[in-house]
């Protein structure tokens, strides 16, 4: 599942780079797959929000929130996400690159990075 998600993510990032005019020398944070979910490219100072991936609901059937589905806009309407929602993780794009996810996946989603590798 994760290999397929990763491949889809890289495609989305490529399309987003073209739309945003991003290239390797552009300031900001490149889109990335972090072994759990897909992060769109971002400008310095931008905070990006993602929902706990649907996969987590397979492992955690008690989880009751609705996760953001990736729509036709590749990365979904991330503007509709809010840190006041449960199951939302953020990263800040800084001059030094992406910040660590906050909260950590384990605490926001009940799922660890290491689980996605097995």
């Amino acid at each position: 599942i994760f290999k397929k998600e990763q491949a889809m993510c890289l495609e989305k990032i490529q399309r987003a780079n073209e739309l945003m005019g991003f290239n390797d020398s552009s300031p900001g944070c490149p889109g990335m797959w972090d072994n759990i979910t897909c992060w769109k490219p971002a400008h310095v100072g931008e905070m990006v929000l993602v929902s706990c991936p649907e996969l987590f609901r397979i492992f955690n059937p008690d989880q009751v929130w609705e996760t953001e589905t990736i729509g036709e806009s590749d990365f979904g309407d991330s503007n509709s996400l809010d840190l006041s929602d449960m199951g939302v993780v953020s990263r800040n794009c800084t001059e030094d690159g992406w910040s660590e996810p906050f909260p950590h996946y384990f605490d926001a989603c009940g799922f660890d990075e290491y689980e996605s590798e097995t």
Epitope: D62, F102, D107, A108, Y114, E115
Partner: antibody, heavy 123, light 107 residues
């Protein structure tokens, strides 16, 4: 029925190491759906989460910054228990120490607790 | 660290009363909030998780609400066994901090 049974000395001398063990029955320390936590309680500091260990294809630990340089939480899979070691204790570490299981259901919560062990740090 | 502040620190009430305890987080924690009850000499006991979900086996007179930074625990029709100390706890981000407690005693 999950039960946590704590053991360890109630008196520790300053500068020495506090060691407590939490034996798990009705669950496994290697469970891939639980976390295993230590919390302490004192009149001056209230309830204070110290750290946790858990297994998700590898062992991980998270510790409170206030004790990070002195604390170790170790699982013992052969006995299905986990332990707390707190080094270089001072009288401020005097507290009731609890072990607890963390369970996930929308978030992490502590649903089963040990009986508590009063540890006094004194010479 | 996220600071959790409870109020009041103590309250006196009678059997049958409806009481409300509040908990405020120093930053938004969504609904990553739990409530515990503790009696003297005993370990804390989980009452409410995710701000408003009742833990299995807990009487329905206990209820929780809130989101973001402000949360409440309500006990409808206080029973003799409810006289205890109540703590809120955030599990949004480690370290998982607790409020200082609210002691409910008999008026």
């Amino acid at each position: 029925q999950v039960q946590l049974q704590q053991s360890g000395p109630g008196l520790v001398k300053p500068s020495q190491t506090l060691s407590l063990t939490c034996a798990i029955s009705g669950d496994s320390v290697s469970s891939n759906s639980a976390t295993w936590n230590w919390i302490r309680q004192s009149p001056s500091r209230g309830l204070e989460w110290l750290g946790r260990t858990y297994y998700r294809s590898k062992w991980s630990n998270h510790y409170a910054v206030s004790v990070k340089s002195r604390i170790t939480i170790n699982p013992d899979t052969s006995k299905s228990q986990f332990s707390l070691q707190l080094n270089s204790v001072t009288p401020e570490d005097t507290a009731v120490y609890y072990c607890a299981r963390g369970t996930w259901k929308q978030l992490w919560f502590l649903d089963h607790w040990g009986q508590g062990t009063l540890v006094t740090v004194s010479s | 660290d996220i600071q959790m502040t409870q109020s009041p620190s103590s309250l006196s009430a009678s059997v049958g009363d409806r009481i409300t305890i509040t908990c405020r987080a120093s930053q938004s924690i969504s609904r990553y909030l739990n409530w515990y009850q503790q009696k003297p000499g005993k370990a804390p006991k989980l009452l409410i998780y995710a701000a408003s979900s009742l833990q299995s086996g807990i009487p329905s007179r206990f209820s929780g609400s809130g989101s973001g930074t402000d949360f409440t625990l309500t006990i409808n029709s206080l029973q003799p066994e409810d006289f205890a100390t109540y703590f809120c706890q955030q599990s949004y981000s480690p370290p998982f901090t607790f409020g200082q407690g609210t002691k409910v005693d008999i008026k």
